[in-house]
Amino acid sequence: KNLKSPQKVEVDIIDDNFILRWNRSDESVGNVTFSFDYQKTGMDNWIKLSGCQNITSTKCNFSSLKLNVYEEIKLRIRAEKENTSSWYEVDSFTPFRKAQIGPPEVHLEAEDKAIVIHISPGTKDSVMWALDGLSFTYSLVIWKNSSGVEERIENIYSRHKIYKLSPETTYCLKVKAALLTSWKIGVYSPVHCIKTTVENELPPPENIEVSVQNQNYVLKWDYTYANMTFQVQWLHAFLKRNPGNHLYKWKQIPDCENVKTTQCVFPQNVFQKGIYLLRVQASDGNNTSFWSEEIKFDTEIQAFLLPPVFNIRSLSDSFHIYIGAPKQSGNTPVIQDYPLIYEIIFWENTSNAERKIIEKKTDVTVPNLKPLTVYCVKARAHTMDEKLNKSSVFSDAVCEKTKPGNTSK
């Protein structure tokens, strides 16, 4: 009896694992083995596919074959008993195009109100993704074990910290990788669960902000208790992208080590141009807080996010404020090529009651003023990028008197 060729050959590639599956064409014939050949582009001869010769099952693994993953290959299969079937040719394919990204490895660390997630590619030193290691991004789904309500977090890197969690609560999560440059979305990791710790005695510092004053950066934060010391550390933001490396060498800012105030001042030349992460920790001598939320600090934006310059045109019941580009030391305007929001604070000169206006426009009307009254105005700029969330310092206050009652038109 002539042996029939196997049919429906499927090639599954996950990371560096190459698996072939096929259907027996004739279940009634026993003791049949199967063998594969492969052929590279531009070659005429077929080569035996190692790992896939004389296979008794309907699955084989040819991961040991060192292929150029960007080069098209063709496969063929036949059945063998005393005689052999004809070859069945599989459509040619390029391994890289066919490959799926496998589940990443996940390592969790718990604090009282935060979880640190370390993510590594599922296959260490993968050949398939050798040129794409730094391009991996990850997304995760996290939920409280007790509720099951899922939250999705997209576009994270190999280290991510989730804040504002509840103490002594079990959270579960799963992570998948993506190579957006190749339109590839991976498969989810197994579910990992971790319980946050009991609430720490000392909370972490909050509301960290960086501003520029003269040639210095001023770092400010809020803290619940008095008589504390603080330390500040920085890390190059790009290091969070480094696959497989989970040793993060946070560095001290020398002028911000063991400071007793909720701010510290350090020279701009501490940082070269770049994007950094900053974090603050509090200590009372006996106990130490966990680190604050990490804020992103871009020297380019920070250095040039100067307070706005503005002119006031006074009417009887309002001010018209015209915001211009801030001036550098040489009186040349700074070009700010990112969108800004302006915060304008104004108050009656004789009062402390401040009112605030937030505007995207550079011409702003301050309404409902009293005639012949001195009002003071100061302004600052904010970036509109949520992730950067930077603010300039306030401009110096400018005080003007409103006109008499009949000049409002």
Epitope: H107, L108, E109, A110, E111, D112, H118, I194, T197, V198, N200, E201, N245, H246, L247, K249, K251, Q252, N286, N287, T288, F290
Partner: antibody
């Protein structure tokens, strides 16, 4: 494979100094932290300090601050522990260890016995 | 400095027994705890890191758990090669500190 090989045993007099070395191979020391740990005879482990060989930044346990110096020579992949003003309670085995992923001291040297005796 | 207190300091046990060693921290260290095994005349060897992650190559009879201030190392069925001293260590804050050790002896 990763290896940390330490210098040989030392017998030194009280008040003197000693410098112990630890040579790493199978990895780039600049990518890691390098730690030193003390173990007195029959006692537990005490962390002395660590260095980041990439920029020579050091951290010391307050107990050892001022009397120990940790340095690194990246050209020879070697880190050093210098102990000064030695006294009898400094008699111990000193271990170097690599600080790797998740800040774990994952590989340790074989230890160097320093005996302080007059 | 963060104090770590291990208990018991000595433990006599037999092959096949289940053993539990605890480590208490004087303040919350998250899950930043490492467990080491040390045999006489040898360097310490990492068994467990980040409280519960077993190092590759360490037998599955070793497991770690806990968070905050209380941590546990369990050996589910003690083998002859497990008789050694075990140390916990916190890596949450400098200076790193170790527990005083638990010596596991043959009964």
């Amino acid at each position: 494979q990763v290896q940390l090989v330490q210098s040989g045993a030392e017998v030194v007099k009280p008040g003197a100094s000693v410098k112990v070395s630890c040579k790493g191979s199978g990895f780039n020391i600049k990518d890691y932290y390098m730690h030193w740990v003390k173990q007195a005879p029959g006692q537990g482990l005490e962390w002395i300090g660590r260095i980041d060989p990439e920029d020579a930044e050091t951290k010391y346990a307050p107990k050892f601050q001022g009397r120990v110096t940790i340095t690194a020579d990246t050209s020879t992949s070697t880190v050093y522990l210098e102990l000064s003003s030695l006294r009898s309670e400094d008699t111990a085995v000193y271990y170097c260890a690599r600080g790797g992923n998740f800040y774990v001291m994952d590989y340790w040297g074989q230890g160097t016995l320093v005996t302080v005796s007059s | 400095d963060i104090q770590l207190t291990q208990s018991p300091s000595f433990l006599s046990t037999s092959v096949g027994d289940r053993v539990t060693i605890t480590c208490k921290a004087s303040q919350n260290v998250g899950t930043n705890v490492v467990w080491y095994q040390q045999k006489p005349g040898k360097s310490p060897k990492v068994l467990i890191y980040s409280a519960s992650y077993r190092v590759s190559g360490v037998p599955s009879r070793f497991s770690g758990s806990g968070s905050g201030t209380e941590f546990t190392l369990i050996i589910s069925s003690v083998q002859p090669e497990d008789f050694a001293t075990y140390f916990c260590q916190q890596k949450n804050n400098y200076p790193y500190t170790f527990g005083q050790g638990t010596k596991l002896e043959i009964k």
